[in-house]
């Protein structure tokens, strides 16, 4: 803190704020009768040097001129950016205790001088809104630096405002609180910023522009949408705006949707007819207006309108697949499945379907409806039967589609031949086949079904299916496919009235099954054994399997074992073996193979045959 | 009621300078655009300079506005018109007017866009 400079003064030539680069001299001066009580000649002045309150430099040697005990001058150079306090203090050399007297300060600023202003741009938001207009300062001035920016116009006016930059605050924007009406839109306006600071000025070049130029107007309000007729792909979208403009831009898109649906209004007058909506379709619109047709600048877009269009009533073809089963000899049990509309064909809230069973020629017909995907009837075995489903809405029913029930599997000479199934990756599977070679009518259509086979999957899951067009021998399938887990493909040649097919198993990956099969009883009939075993749990087969192996070999011989190799087959849980020795202890075991390899064996059963050996 | 006074008038050499002054009562400046009008004998009364109370911003006719400047004085509610380097066409009866918002740029020299007037004070500047 210094003292209120009573001791004496102290001045800065060639003044206290100094361009960078430049030197100064400072000179401190003791008032009359002021200094050491003793002799003058025991005065000693020093000048310390503080930066950001610290002392950093003691400018003894930095005398220039010194009239002893009166005053001295001392010249500092290389002097940073900012503000350096000096502070001159009087030393009285026969007094080493006392320390040093502050006798008083000054502040010295370095700086540049401003450079022209630059980029200025201004902006009214809006009709009502007022001008305010930005530009770059260029470098920092380290000097507090006023800036003037002067907006001159129609009717002899000039407009000015001011503001100043120094180490606290930036000025480089200024909002003039003056609004330009449209009556101005033909008028040209002229804005400057200068810059002025203790080092000098310097202005920008003059920015011409009209009210078309900055005005942006202010985004459309109060968005809504209105329905022709409860309509759920024609709607009138409207909004308010300014008065004044004549432009609008649109866009709109589904919700899930990355790309817009741009369109350009002229004269709209917050108006404007949709013609191509999705019903049932969460949108999204927002609004953009321009006041000139050529010229002027897009306001921000509207805070969105988010809104379902309505329903209309179904479009589409359901696409229906079946099961049937004899129950005994005069009834059969006939499963129909069908997949949901996709949205775009729903284009509502599916409430149910409308299902129909009619026998063709006694004209016995069984309807109902149900929310679900499946419907299951018990019919007679006798009689041509199709059927039918069709998908409602609050607006409608679709279209029904029919299916003739048919024999799936009952015509061999409509089974597709040379069935192959390749797994692609990691989820689904290439099925491919050859078509029927004596069909003696033509096939309509493919249908490519698959389900795990797991314990119960035909009545606790409904199958999948693919319809291929008959000129197609291939399918990939995908839906509800998961690695390591073995899958029923049929594949189904249907013609008018009839059905062929053929079946394989595959998967879309592999590895060796967790264990082998367990065997469960060791039988002697007829001088053969019959070995029985469990399958595999589902879980540990890990694919599909191939083949089981059975091994066996004398107890105690270190021999390697024989074997028998049967091709799996899931009905088949035992199998005979011929070749052992009577009253010969055996241990056996068995493996399962997948193609990715063998399992590890299952557990071991010791048998000793007592018939005759063969 | 609300009230402007004018003062500062006075009879100056060309060259000279002076300083009027417009006092509010019975209402604050606040959100209003103050206006200094001139009226010479035989003419119609024109825009000299304004001071927008809220924003800051400062309007000069083309015939002033390197010689007259205008501030405030926001303790005493009054606003402030320095003319210097006065000249002989400068002589009229000079008022100061009071408008309120909104504040356009098409608005800011029309007189009748001015809600409130004082009586006026006479500037003379003899050659």
């Known amino acids: 803190n210094i003292d209120v400079c009573k001791l004496g003064t102290v001045t800065v030539q060639p003044a206290p704020v100094i361009p960078l680069g430049s030197a100064a001299n400072i000179s401190c001066s003791l008032n009359p009768k002021q200094g050491c009580s003793h002799y003058p000649s025991s005065n000693e002045l020093i000048l310390l040097k503080f930066v950001n309150d610290v002392l950093v430099e003691n400018l003894h040697g930095k005398k220039v001129h010194d009239h002893t005990g009166h005053s001295s001058t001392f010249q500092v150079t290389n002097l940073s950016l900012g503000m350096t306090l000096f502070v001159c203090k009087l030393n009285c050399s026969n007094s080493q205790k006392k320390p040093p007297v502050p006798v008083c300060g000054v502040e010295i600023s370095v700086g540049v001088a401003p450079e022209p202003p630059q980029n200025i741009s201004c902006v009214q938001e809006g009709e009502n809104g007022t001008v305010a207009c930005s530009w770059n300062s260029g470098k920092v001035t380290y000097l507090k630096t006023n800036y003037t920016l002067q907006l001159s116009g129609p009717n002899n006016l000039t407009c000015q405002k001011q503001c100043f930059s120094d180490n606290r605050q930036n000025c480089n924007r200024l909002d003039l609180g003056i609004n330009l009406s449209p009556d101005l839109a033909e008028s040209r306006f002229i804005v400057r910023v200068t810059a002025i600071n203790d080092l000098g000025n310097s202005s920008s070049l003059p920015h011409t522009f009209t009210f078309l130029d900055i005005v942006i107007p202010l985004p459309p309000w109060d968005i809504r949408i209105n329905f022709l007729n409860a309509s759920g792909s024609r709607g009138t979208l409207q909004w308010e705006d300014e008065g004044q403009v004549v432009l609008n831009q649109l866009r709109y898109q589904p919700l899930n949707s990355t790309s817009w649906n741009m369109v350009n209004a002229t004269n709209a007058k917050g108006k404007y007819d949709l013609r191509d909506l999705r019903p049932f379709t969460e949108y999204e619109f927002q609004i953009s207006s321009k006041l000139h047709l050529s010229g002027g600048s897009w306001s921000n877009w509207s805070e969105s309108l988010r809104t379902r269009t309505p329903e209309e009533e179904p479009v589409g073809i359901l696409d229906i697949w079946y099961m049937k089963q004899d129950i005994d000899y005069d009834r059969q049990q006939i499963s129909l499945f069908w997949k949901s509309l996709n949205p775009s064909e729903a284009r509502g809230k599916i409430l149910h379907y409308q299902v129909t069973l009619q026998e063709v020629t006694k004209k016995t017909t069984l309807q109902n409806t149900t929310r679900h995907t499946s419907w299951t009837r018990v019919i007679p075995r006798t009689g041509a039967w199709t059927a039918s489903v069709s998908a409602a809405n609050s607006k409608g029913a679709s279209a029904p589609t029919h299916i003739n029930i048919v024999d799936l599997c009952g015509t061999g000479l409509l089974a597709p031949h040379q069935v192959s199934a390749k797994s692609e990756n990691m989820d689904n599977i290439l099925v491919t086949w050859q078509p029927p070679k004596k069909a003696d009518s033509a096939v309509r259509e493919y249908i490519v079904e698959w389900r795990a086979l797991q314990p119960g999957s035909i009545t606790k899951f409904p199958p999948h299916w693919l319809r291929i067009p008959p000129d197609n021998m291939s399918a990939l399938i995908s839906e509800n496919i998961k690695p390591y887990i073995c899958y029923e493909i049929r594949v189904h040649a249907l013609s008018e009235s009839q059905g062929g097919c053929s079946s394989i198993r595959g998967d879309s990956k592999h590895k060796a099954p967790v264990s082998g099969p367990h065997i469960t009883a060791i039988t002697e009939k007829k001088e053969r054994l019959f070995i029985s075993w469990t399958h595999i749990p589902f879980p540990e087969q890990r694919g599909c399997i191939l083949h089981y192996r059975i091994y066996w070999k004398e107890r105690d011989s270190t021999a390697q074992p024989e074997l028998c190799e049967i091709q799996y087959r899931r009905s088949q849980n035992s199998h005979p073996i011929s070749s052992l020795q009577p009253r010969v202890t055996y241990v056996l075991w068995m493996t399962a193979v997948t193609a990715a390899g063998e399992s590890p064996q299952g557990n071991e059963r010791e048998f000793c045959p007592q018939g005759k050996a063969n | 009621q609300v009230q402007l006074q004018e003062s500062g008038g006075g009879l100056v050499q060309a060259g000279g300078s002076l300083r009027l002054s417009c006092a509010a009562s019975?209402?604050?400046?606040?959100?209003?655009?103050i206006g200094w009008f001139r009226q010479a004998p035989g003419k119609e009364r024109e825009f000299v300079a304004a001071?927008?109370?809220?924003?800051?911003?400062?309007f000069f006719t083309d015939s002033v506005k390197d010689r007259f400047s205008i501030s405030r004085d926001n303790a005493k509610n009054t606003v402030l018109l320095q003319m210097n380097s006065l000249k002989p066409e400068d002589t009229a009866v000079y008022y100061c007017?009071?408008?309120?918002?909104?504040?356009?740029?098409?608005?800011?020299?029309?007189?009748?866009?001015?809600?409130?007037w004082g009586q006026g004070t006479q500037v003379t500047v003899s050659s």
């Open positions: 019975g209402f604050t400046f606040d959100d209003y655009t």
């Open positions: 007017a009071a408008k309120n918002p909104p504040h356009r740029w098409s608005d800011i020299t029309k007189s009748l866009q001015y809600a409130y």
């Open positions: 001071l927008s109370w809220s924003a800051g911003s400062t």
